[in-house]
């Protein structure tokens, strides 16, 4: 991409996965490319094959070990290279000195469940997945509730500025179907970003008791 643009973006899930996206203007869809990871202080190195995700964008996951193993620390630096095949040889297209704990994106929260539901409120809990013990309690969450007739984008964001893996939703309408999502972000890291949203949890508020004011 001499006159186009390219972008190489990677995130560490804080345990044993580095996910990367490589995009390049004008690159051919069938171009064969890889990401190579070379840590500065580890015996292992790792490679993944970039697979197309859109017209000029490829992605892959560097699996560093068992999902819950702590493969990197805050002092590690991993040199990441994009290599693409040009005829019989591999050509280095991009290089990044990757600081894992400056580029965090955790896995989406899991195990969402309704703890208790009433006519106007609902208590929901969740768990974080594959998150490093290094964070201790230094995490924050965002949540959103999908109301009937609205889109996710219209849903107001609820911010939890601490490691709180539950929420009590209030001022809900009785006998109404809702959906709920949550995402997580460590406080650490200059280039850290929010996790993907969790799978939506569907729930229904209880109907109002007959003959009573709501």
């Amino acid at each position: 991409a001499v006159n186009g643009t390219s972008q190489f973006t990677c995130f560490y899930n804080s345990r044993a996965n580095i996910s990367c996206v490589w995009s390049q203007d004008g690159a051919l869809q069938d171009t064969s490319c890889q990401v190579h990871a070379w840590p500065d202080r580890r015996r292992w190195n790792q490679t993944c094959e970039l697979l197309p995700v859109s017209q000029a964008s490829w992605a892959c996951n560097l699996i560093l070990g068992a999902p819950d193993s702590q493969k990197l620390t805050t002092v590690d630096i991993v040199t990441l290279r994009v290599l693409c095949r040009e005829g019989v040889r591999w050509r280095v297209m991009a290089i990044q000195d990757f600081k894992p704990f400056e580029n965090l994106r955790l896995m989406a929260p899991i195990s969402l469940q309704v703890v208790h539901v009433e006519t106007h409120r609902c208590n929901i809990s969740w768990e974080i997945s594959q998150a490093s013990h290094y964070f201790e309690r230094h995490l924050e969450f965002e949540a959103r509730t999908l109301s009937p007739g609205h889109t996710w984008e219209e849903a107001p964001l609820l911010t939890l500025k601490q490691k709180q893996e539950w929420i009590c939703l209030e001022t809900l309408t009785p006998d109404t179907q809702y959906e709920f999502q949550v995402r997580v972000k460590p406080l650490q890291g200059e280039f850290t970003t929010w996790s993907p949203w969790s799978q939506p949890l569907a729930f229904r508020t209880k109907p109002a008791a007959l003959g009573k004011d709501t």
Partner: nanobody, 123 residues
Framework: EVQLVESGGGLVQAGGSLRLSCAAS????????VGWFRQAPGKEREFVAA????????LYADSVKGRFTISRDNAKNTVYLQMSSLKPEDTALYYC????????????????WGQGTQVTVSS
């Protein structure tokens, strides 16, 4: 914001050597690896070489591989381009540029640019 200042250009005979310097300043400079580009009169700007601050990983254009060496001094926040076996076709205005986190050969991937330093190789 990253500021870049080039120096070291000049007039040299073919076969000679020259060392260019690029002094970088700004916040968290290690997040902004540096590349050298050049532009000859009437031609497009082209990639020469690039280096990352932390590991010192490098990229080169095929046309300069084996003749030019890029290096860095982290203590001085300076990147060097050692040019040897210079040819008249190396005559150009040489720019250093900084990119966010990643070095590539694409000039559009670099956000910050110096003013340039002139290199003239006479035959």
């Amino acid at each position: 914001e990253v500021q870049l200042v080039e120096s070291g250009g000049g007039l040299v005979q073919a076969g000679g050597s020259l060392r260019l310097s690029c002094a970088a300043s700004g916040r968290a400079i290690e997040n902004y690896p540096v590349g050298w580009f050049r532009q000859a009169p009437g031609k497009e700007r082209e990639f020469v070489a690039a280096i990352t601050w932390i590991s010192g990983s490098t990229l080169y254009a095929d046309s300069v591989k084996g003749r030019f060496t890029i290096s860095r001094d982290n203590a001085k926040n300076t990147v060097y381009l050692q040019m040897s076996s210079l040819k008249p076709e190396d005559t150009a205005l040489y720019y250093c540029a900084a990119a966010l986190k990643t070095i590539t050969r694409g000039q559009n991937d670099y956000s910050y640019w110096g003013q340039g330093t002139q290199v003239t190789v006479s035959s």
